[in-house]
Interface confidence: low
């Protein structure tokens, strides 16, 4: 006989990412004996909750909690039974719930209470359901990306920890209802609300972050739809040959389209809207989402929001990745430069509905919206955030790193479970992201 070394005991953590359009569950794992090492936590499994985001259950809070049951049942299988009681479970809601909380705080509270009631029924260590601020969403996305890519700290060949010289990566997240930009900066932010200071592994990071509510992909599409109805009577970003019935109540129910809402409109009225495949008019429509007329600081991104110049490399994930991936993979268009990205957007916007369907067989959901999405991403990066060709060369569009989805969820769990120490390795003390 010979001795067989047992694999190290694993610990688990669960995060429910309650986004505006859907909820995803992520289960993370890490070796119990290496809790404070970097790059040790990885994704064990994930599950997409069927149906819409929890904010869509404003009129039916119990429906929100019921929708989670399938994924929670999967979690019971994915996490070993003996680990259930010690597995932290978190639910974080983002911009969809932030919007609901602005328009109907009672409904938002009811949804969170219903969800909490269901989550406490499971044998996990439930640690709360809450709405993340835009700042938290941005910062935790940045932490996730840099943790996975081992930018905070590495174990050297000489057998000690060191801080990599390459510096941190900026993070850009395009969700359904908001978009976040976060990056390390050397100078203090002129706007206190846009700065977060972090202590990770004995290093100090000054991070600029801003979340633009109503600038997520879905809300942008709604706003463009409202603008098209208001100014054109046709949709320049939709392909010619594509036509659909638009329910006015759906268009104007979001607080993001409130400014475009007609004085007296029939919410149950349907309007027929057709596409016109007009890239130039589409670009103008998208441009209308950004205001550069005023800036109460030394410099701004858009809408009077302070932003230092973008610096260093960036990872762009979620809908940034899906949009660029569509252009690259489905359309076969190069997007290595800003000029190419703009040309790709124009190319998609020039396609008729028949051409688009022929080019992307297997009828992709929301195919008609890719022109607007591509045009928005291009404008947001170049005009909005101020990426020039050189800076854009440092942007990578990525969905996963180290087999783990890039998003705020991992960073959120790392923070709440104190898996990133504030002090250098050797000292075992937690960190506070407040």
């Amino acid at each position: 006989t010979r001795d067989v070394r047992e694999p190290p005991a694993l610990k688990y953590g669960i995060v429910l990412d309650a986004g505006s359009s859907h909820t995803s569950m992520f289960i993370y794992k890490w070796p119990a004996d290496k809790e404070n090492d970097t790059g040790i936590v990885g994704q064990h499994s994930s599950c997409d909750v069927p149906g819409g985001g929890i904010s869509s259950y404003a009129d039916n809070p119990s429906g929100a909690s019921q929708s989670l049951v399938g994924c929670l049942e999967q979690a019971l299988q994915d996490v070993p039974k003996e680990r259930h009681a010690g597995t932290p479970l978190y639910l974080g809601a983002t911009a969809g719930m932030r919007l609901l909380n602005l328009t109907n705080p009672e409904a938002s509270t009811s949804v969170l209470m219903a969800v909490t009631h269901t989550l406490t029924q499971y044998p996990f260590d439930f640690r709360g359901a809450r709405i993340l601020s835009g700042q938290e969403e941005g910062v935790f996305g940045w932490v996730t990306a840099n943790y996975l890519l081992e930018n905070f700290i590495k174990y050297g060949w000489v057998g000690r920890w060191f801080r990599p010289r390459k510096g941190t990566l900026g993070a850009m997240d395009l969700g359904g209802a908001s978009t976040q930009i976060t990056f390390e900066t050397t100078s203090p932010a002129e706007d206190r609300a846009s700065e977060v200071q972090l202590h990770l592994y004995g290093q100090h990071y000054r991070v600029y972050t801003h979340s633009f509510l109503c600038y997520g992909r879905d809300q942008v599409l709604q706003r463009l739809l409202a603008s098209a109805l208001q100014t054109h009577g046709f949709h320049p970003c939709w392909p010619r040959g594509f036509s659909t019935q638009v329910l006015l109540g759906d268009v104007y129910q979001s607080p993001c389209t409130m400014a475009q809402r007609p004085q007296n409109f029939n919410s149950s009225a349907r309007v027929s809207l057709s596409g016109s495949s007009d890239p130039h008019l589409c670009r103008d429509l998208v441009s209308g989402l950004f205001s550069f007329s005023s800036c109460p600081f030394s410099r701004c991104s858009f809408n009077g929001v302070f932003q230092p110049p973008v610096a260093g490399n960036f990872v762009a994930f979620s809908a940034f990745f899906y949009t660029v991936d569509f252009l690259r993979t489905s359309m076969g268009l190069p997007v290595a430069t800003l000029q190419q990205l703009e040309a790709a957007a124009v190319n998609v916007c020039n396609q008729t509905w028949a051409q688009l369907q022929a080019r992307v067989p297997g009828q992709r959901a929301r195919l008609a919206d890719y022109c607007a999405g591509a045009m928005f991403v291009q404008q947001l990066l170049s005009r909005g955030y101020g990426f020039d060709e050189r800076a854009f060369g440092g942007v990578i569009f990525q969905k996963k790193a180290a087999d783990t989805a890039v998003g705020w969820a991992l960073g959120y769990m790392l923070n709440l479970t104190n898996l990133i120490p504030a002090d250098p390795p050797g000292l075992r003390k937690g960190t506070d992201f407040s």
């Epitope: 706007d191 993001c256 005023s294 929001v305 302070f306």
Partner: antibody
């Protein structure tokens, strides 16, 4: 309760300087910029400038550059404004005001959500 | 700098009357704030970003407008509304205030 405490009045001679204070309480002092506003007798309001207490970053209305200097003492949660080379034109009520913000639609809407009671500066020989 | 012109300069209103104060900007601004200043006190935030009522402000106050023209409406004037009202823009540096409208109650 959020409060900005200012002291009543200062009588000063022309050509001299005066330093007026504004003590904040009821909130985290470094979380909000502090602005200063001038109101001459029977007249409107005029923005002088602001200071970010966290980093001592100041922004001034061009009209008050060289006239006003804004500082803070974080340990006592107090903001100061020094006015120099005083003339009768500087006779006015000076208010400190906390800069509130309402982040929405991707914008930050700034406004003055809390005001001090004002300090009356009278410049007279 | 952006000049804000308020009119009228002085307004006299009866109790229960609906009145509108206006503020015109020398060039387009994104939004407007309104402050109320009662005699001998400091200004108080009334309406922020054009139409949002500040905490504790009665619902008889409302604001609207866009571009270069903004207005403040009091739907039913009460005695306690006697004050100076200032509009304030935070769109363009330096931030400026209107000259004010004095509201007197008949």
């Amino acid at each position: 309760e959020v409060q900005l405490q200012q002291f009543g009045a200062e009588l000063v001679k022309p050509g001299t300087s005066v330093k007026i204070s504004c003590k904040a309480s009821g909130y985290t002092f470094t979380d909000y910029n502090m602005d200063w506003v001038k109101q001459s007798h029977g007249k409107s309001l005029e923005w002088i400038g602001d200071i970010n207490p966290n980093y001592d970053i100041t922004t001034y209305n061009q009209r008050f550059k060289g006239k006003a200097t804004l500082t803070v003492d974080k340990s006592s949660s107090t903001a100061y404004m020094e006015l120099r080379s005083l003339t009768s034109e500087d006779t006015a009520v000076y208010y400190c005001a906390r800069r509130g913000f309402f982040p929405y639609y991707g914008n930050s809407y700034y406004y003055f959500d809390v005001w001090g009671a004002g300090t009356t500066v009278t410049v007279s020989s | 700098q952006i000049v804000l012109t308020q009119s009228p300069t002085i307004m006299s209103a009866s109790l229960g009357e609906e009145i509108t104060l206006t503020c015109s900007a020398s060039s387009s601004v994104s939004y407007m704030h309104w402050y109320q200043q009662k005699s001998g006190t400091s200004p108080k935030l009334l309406i922020y970003s054009t139409s949002n009522l500040a905490s504790g402000v009665p619902s008889r106050f409302s604001g609207s407008g866009s571009g270069t023209f903004y207005s403040l409406t009091i739907s039913s004037v009460e005695a306690e509304d006697a004050a100076d009202y200032y509009c304030h823009q935070w769109s363009n540096y330096p931030w400026t205030f209107g000259g004010g409208t004095k509201l007197e109650i008949k």
